[in-house]
Amino acid sequence: DSSKWVFEHPETLYAWEGACVWIPCTYRALDGDLESFILFHNPEYNKNTSKFDGTRLYESTKDGKVPSEQKRVQFLGDKNKNCTLSIHPVHLNDSGQLGLRMESKTEKWMERIHLNVSERPFPPHIQLPPEIQESQEVTLTCLLNFSCYGYPIQLQWLLEGVPMRQAAVTSTSLTIKSVFTRSELKFSPQWSHHGKIVTCQLQDADGKFLSNDTVQLNVKHTPKLEIKVTPSDAIVREGDSVTMTCEVSSSNPEYTTVSWLKDGTSLKKQNTFTLNLREVTKDQSGKYCCQVSNDVGPGRSEEVFLQVQYA
C-alpha cells in the first residue's frame, strides 16, 4: 500500500528489570523528512482531541537536545531513515506497547512495537540436535532473545555443574530482523555422557549468575559390556567346566539381541547372557567375547582368552 509509511523492526523485544533494550528500526516516510517524533508508552487514540494519549517517553522537540547521558530513553535515529531506540535502564512497567508517533510536514504515522520486560532475567534456551550419537560431533546451541549495547552478558556452558573445556562461539544480533545472543559449542559426546546434565548459564559482565537452562543428554550408543569368567584366570584342564557371563553396563536404546563369539565366529544357539561350557576339550581354547546389539549397532565385550590344558 503506497499510502503507508514503511517500517522494519523486530515485532517484540524482550528484556528484564534493570537491563536495557536496544530497538533496531528503519523507516521510510511518506513525504520528505520527519519534523517531529514522540515515543509513547501504551498510546490510545483520543477521538475528542484527535490526538494520542499515553506516557511520553521521548519527544524529539524536547529530548533531542538534552545531553544523552541524562536520558533513559534515547532516539538514535534521524529524520529520514533510522528510528533506532534505546531504553537504559528498562523497567518492569515499560512492558506493553511502544508507539512511535512520526510526523512529517503533511503526514502522520503511529508505529507500534511490543516490549516484554520480566521481573527477573529470563532463561536462555538450549537447542540440541534431534539425535546425539556417541563420538559424533554435535553443536549445542544456547539462545537468548536479548542483546543490548549497554548491558553486556555472557553465556557459559556447564556439564554436571563444571565448566566445559570446549571453546564456545558467542554471536549477537541487533538487527531489524532479530535481536538475540547465541552461544554454540561443538562437542563430541561419549557414551558416558548419557543422562548427564548440560547447563547454559546466563551471566552478567562480571560473571554473576542471572538465569540458566538445563537439558539431560540423550546420547545414543551401542551396548557397553563387561565379561566375567569363572575361573577368573580362564585357565582350565580338559574336562573342566567354564562359565562366562555378559553384563550390559549401558545401552541406549535398549538392547535387542545377544550372541557369543569364539575367535570372531558366532556360536550357534548361544543367545543368553551366560555361556556354560561343560567338559571342555582342547579345541575349545580361543578368544571369547559377547556381542549385544541395539538399534545403533553391535557392542562387543573385551575378549577372554580361554586356555584349555591337557588333563
Epitope: 524536547k62 545531553p67 544523552s68
Partner: antibody, heavy 120, light 112 residues
Framework: EVQLVESGGGLVQPGGSLRLSCAAS????????MNWVRQAPGKGLEWVGR????????NYSGKFKGRFTISADTSKNTAYLQMNSLRAEDTAVYYC?????????????WGQGTLVTVSS | DIQMTQSPSSLSASVGDRVTITCRSS???????????LEWYQQKPGKAPKLLIY???NRFSGVPSRFSGSGSGTDFTLTISSLQPEDFATYYC?????????FGQGTKVEIK
C-alpha cells in the same frame, strides 16, 4: 506566521521584582523550548535559561539560578521570566527566543525585546 | 562554563571585501550525541538577533549564500565572501552543546 512578543519591562528599583512575559503564536507552543536571552546596553548577548512548556522542564545559566525563575502557561501560550532581587547590572533588553527544530537546534524566532532598567 | 572568544572584536571593511570572523571555544563543544551546536547570529542596532548559520556550517533558510561557516572541535569561522551594505552589523557565535549555553562577545563589522 510564528511570532514572539515580550512585555512587562520597565523601571524597577534595586532589590525589586519584575515578571516578563513572552506571548507565542503561530506554532505548537508546548513542543518547543523557549529561551530567555538578555543584552546589557552596549554589551553582548547572554543566555539566561530555557523551559520546555510541554512539561515545565527548565535549565538555567548558573549565574541566574535562585534569583530568576522561568515558567510557562500552555493555556495562554505564554512563557514568563520572574526576576527577583534585581540589581543595577540586570539592566538589559530581555529577549525570548524559540529553539525551533527537532533535529538541528537553533534560535530561529526572536521577540522584539523588552527593556528592564534597574535604578533608584 | 565554556568561554567563546571571537576575533577580531571589530573590523572595518569595504563593500565587496571578503570578511572572516573567528570564534574559539575554551573546550570542545561536541554534544554527547556527536553534533556540534555552533551557531552564528547577526544583530543590527535596536533589533533582535537573526540566525545565519547553525551546526557549524548549515545556512539557515533565506540567508544569502555569501555567508558560510566552517570549523570543528574548538575553532570556528564565519566568512562573508563579498560584503554587502546590509551586512554591516555585529556578529555573535553561540554554543548550544553544553550548559550553560554561551555567546561570544561579538564582532562589529563597520564600513571603512
Amino acid at each position: 506566521e510564528v511570532q514572539l512578543v515580550e512585555s512587562g519591562g520597565g523601571l524597577v528599583q534595586p532589590g525589586g521584582s519584575l515578571r516578563l512575559s513572552c506571548a507565542a503564536s503561530g506554532y505548537e507552543f508546548s513542543r518547543s523550548w523557549m529561551n530567555w536571552v538578555r543584552q546589557a546596553p552596549g554589551k553582548g548577548l547572554e543566555w539566561v535559561g530555557r523551559i520546555y512548556p510541554g512539561d515545565g522542564d527548565t535549565n538555567y545559566s548558573g549565574k541566574f539560578k535562585g534569583r530568576f525563575t522561568i515558567s510557562a502557561d500552555t493555556s495562554k501560550n505564554t512563557a514568563y521570566l520572574q526576576m527577583n532581587s534585581l540589581r543595577a547590572e540586570d539592566t538589559a533588553v530581555y529577549y525570548c527566543a524559540r529553539d525551533g527544530s527537532s533535529w538541528d537546534w537553533y534560535f530561529d524566532v526572536w521577540g522584539q525585546g523588552t527593556l528592564v532598567t534597574v535604578s533608584s | 562554563d565554556i568561554q567563546m572568544t571571537q576575533s577580531p572584536s571589530s573590523l572595518s571593511a569595504s563593500v565587496g571585501d571578503r570578511v572572516t570572523i573567528t570564534c574559539r571555544s575554551s573546550q570542545s563543544i561536541v554534544h554527547s550525541d556527536g553534533n556540534t551546536f555552533l551557531e552564528w547570529y547577526q544583530q543590527k542596532p535596536g533589533k533582535a538577533p537573526k540566525l545565519l548559520i547553525y551546526k557549524v556550517s548549515n545556512r539557515f533558510s533565506g540567508v544569502p549564500s555569501r555567508f558560510s561557516g566552517s570549523g570543528s572541535g574548538t575553532d570556528f569561522t564565519l566568512t562573508i565572501s563579498s560584503l554587502q551594505p546590509e551586512d554591516f552589523a555585529t556578529y555573535y557565535c553561540f554554543q548550544g552543546s553544553q550548559f550553560p549555553y554561551t555567546f561570544g562577545q561579538g564582532t562589529k563589522v563597520e564600513i571603512k
